[in-house]
């Protein structure tokens, strides 16, 4: 059994996340998960999830309770999701941590935003004509 | 040249993003893109700078000004980073509007770490000794 | 004050087995990741094995698989390295090295701390 | 493969600047953070560079490290040469499946 495991059954008796009432109105993720077979389309989405969970982790890490079994799988998280490697979570925390409502962080992001948007399609790298089929549009004539 | 750079730049005069003092202290997403160049880890990144950019976008949604040229980047994110395919765009949404602070959904969230956890890692599909091998780690007996 | 003292070293004969160990102290134990790594006489060093903090999920050099073993003793601050079917080219100096806590985003550098290293010899 | 190749040795006079690189073989550099190690004879290696550019406290600011993307390569540069500069210095980063990895050392002697 992966460590998480044990880890994850903590946390849920800590949130009594294990009562019947909890499945109610469908699930935040799973059935998201189930949509997105394309391992890029699953990295779009997971993305998303794990900052959730860094996130949720963060507003509990004071508490004792549940210290070790957050850090547990926090680490298994970086295992799994990050390949243990720590340049790759640095830059995933750097962009979670950015501030929207920073007037500087707000300028440098309009600032980038045309060459963010360059290399936003899968084929960005491989020129203009290439990448029109990849995302199926073609600009109509101006 | 593509749609949304002549709005871009109308965000730029906007929130002063031409002046030279923007590109002190480095980037925001640029370096960080540049350090990834498999799909899966560029999706990982993107993911968050995309809903960075639709956070920020969502602050301006009411000024008149700026309206245009934010709608037409945004129907360009649609097409190039979630290939105009709305019910991506909608999870991803989805996604990116859980509350942390909701008990409700932090319940849910620690009732679907097991499946979630058990998916993170890129082979999570094609069973556990499959799985050890794509991030190339055992777990030692207890 | 950061620690890791190896033991276990020796003489041993090609085709034996040997377990080499790792005591540390100064850290809290279980939050990192432990390395082993060795130094043949003369040679520069190589990667051997990783064993995880919390999760105990063990990586090893594709050379090594199958041969060596690592495991750890959180409750003891320990970390082993099992070798069996030992060789010549296994004649090395082998290193406990200090890792990441890959749970902590602002964790100290990786192979930050070494320890002195023990000396295995395989001779016949 | 994965292989981090070094230069085998260096000289250069005191006082002078040397730069040892470190070509990684697959992969790209900027996708795994690199640390330089400093192995004085009979010594344990210890980290002078971690995670590209960082210094850990101690080592001196003539001591640094870099990355270039456009030759696929970290550098480590030490200026104003001492004579206790003279040891083997080691490249480290980690290969796709974040396996750890080392060049092949390369020999600074100080003339």
């Known amino acids: 059994q992966d460590p998480y495991v044990k880890e994850a059954e903590n946390l849920k008796k800590y949130f009594n996340a294990g009562d019947p009432d909890v499945a109610d109105n469908g699930t935040l993720f799973l059935d998201i998960l189930r949509n997105w077979k394309e391992e890029s389309d699953r990295k779009i989405m997971q993305s998303q999830i794990v900052s959730f969970y860094f996130k949720l982790f963060k507003n509990f890490k004071d508490d004792q309770r549940i210290q070790k079994s957050v850090e547990t799988i926090k680490e298994d998280i970086n295992v799994k999701f990050f390949n243990s490697n720590k340049k790759k979570r640095d830059d995933f925390e750097k962009l979670t941590n950015y501030s929207v409502t920073d007037s500087n962080v707000q300028r440098k992001a309009v600032h980038e935003l045309i060459q963010v948007m360059a290399e936003l399609s899968p084929a960005a790298k491989i020129g203009k004509r290439k990448r029109s089929q990849m995302f199926r549009g073609r600009r109509a004539s101006q | 040249q593509d749609p949304y750079v002549k709005e871009a730049e109308n965000l730029k005069k906007y929130f002063n993003a031409g002046d030279p003092d923007v590109a002190d202290n480095g980037t925001l997403f640029l370096d960080i893109l540049r350090n990834w160049k498999e799909e899966s880890d560029r999706k990982i990144m993107q993911s968050q700078i995309v809903s960075f950019y639709f956070k920020l976008f969502k602050n301006f949604k009411d000024d008149q000004r700026i309206q245009k040229s934010v709608e037409t980047i945004k129907e360009d994110i649609n097409v190039k980073f979630f290939n105009s395919n709305k019910k991506k765009r909608d999870d991803f949404e989805k996604l990116t509007n859980y509350s942390v602070t909701d008990s409700n959904v932090q319940r849910k969230a620690v009732h679907e770490l097991i499946q979630v956890m058990a998916e993170l890692s890129p082979a999570a599909k094609i069973g556990k000794r499959k799985r050890s091998q794509m991030f190339r780690g055992r777990r030692a007996s207890q | 004050e950061v620690q890791l003292v190896e033991s276990g070293g020796g003489l041993v004969k090609p085709g034996d087995s040997l377990t080499v160990s790792c005591v540390a102290s100064g850290f809290t134990f279980s939050n990192y990741f432990i390395h082993w790594v060795r130094q043949a006489p003369g040679k520069g060093l190589e990667w051997v094995a990783t064993?995880?903090?919390?999760?105990?999920?063990?990586f090893y050099s594709d050379s090594l698989r199958g041969r060596f073993t690592v495991s750890r003793d959180n409750a003891n601050n320990s970390v082993y390295l099992h070798m069996s079917s030992l060789r010549g080219e296994d004649t090395a100096l082998y290193y406990c090295?200090?890792?990441?806590?890959?749970?902590?985003?602002?964790?100290?550098?990786?192979?930050?701390?070494w320890g002195r290293g023990t000396l295995v010899t395989v001779s016949s | 493969n994965f292989m981090l190749t070094q230069p085998h040795s260096v000289s250069e006079s005191p006082g002078k600047t040397i730069t040892i690189s470190c070509t990684r073989g697959?992969?790209?550099?900027?996708?795994?953070?690199v640390q330089w190690y400093q192995q004085r004879p009979g010594g344990v290696p210890k980290i002078v560079v971690f995670e590209d550019t960082q210094r850990p406290s101690g080592v001196p600011d003539r001591i640094s490290g870099s990355i270039d993307t456009s030759t696929n390569s970290a550098s480590l540069t030490i200026s104003g040469l001492q004579t206790e500069d003279e040891a083997d210095y080691y490249c480290q980063s980690y290969d796709d499946a974040n396996h750890v990895i080392f060049g092949g050392g390369t020999k600074l002697t100080v003339l």
């Open positions: 064993i995880s903090g919390r999760t105990k999920y063990m």
């Open positions: 090295v200090r890792g990441y806590d890959h749970s902590d985003s602002n964790s100290a550098a990786d192979l930050l701390h």
């Open positions: 697959r992969g790209y550099i900027a996708s795994y953070y």
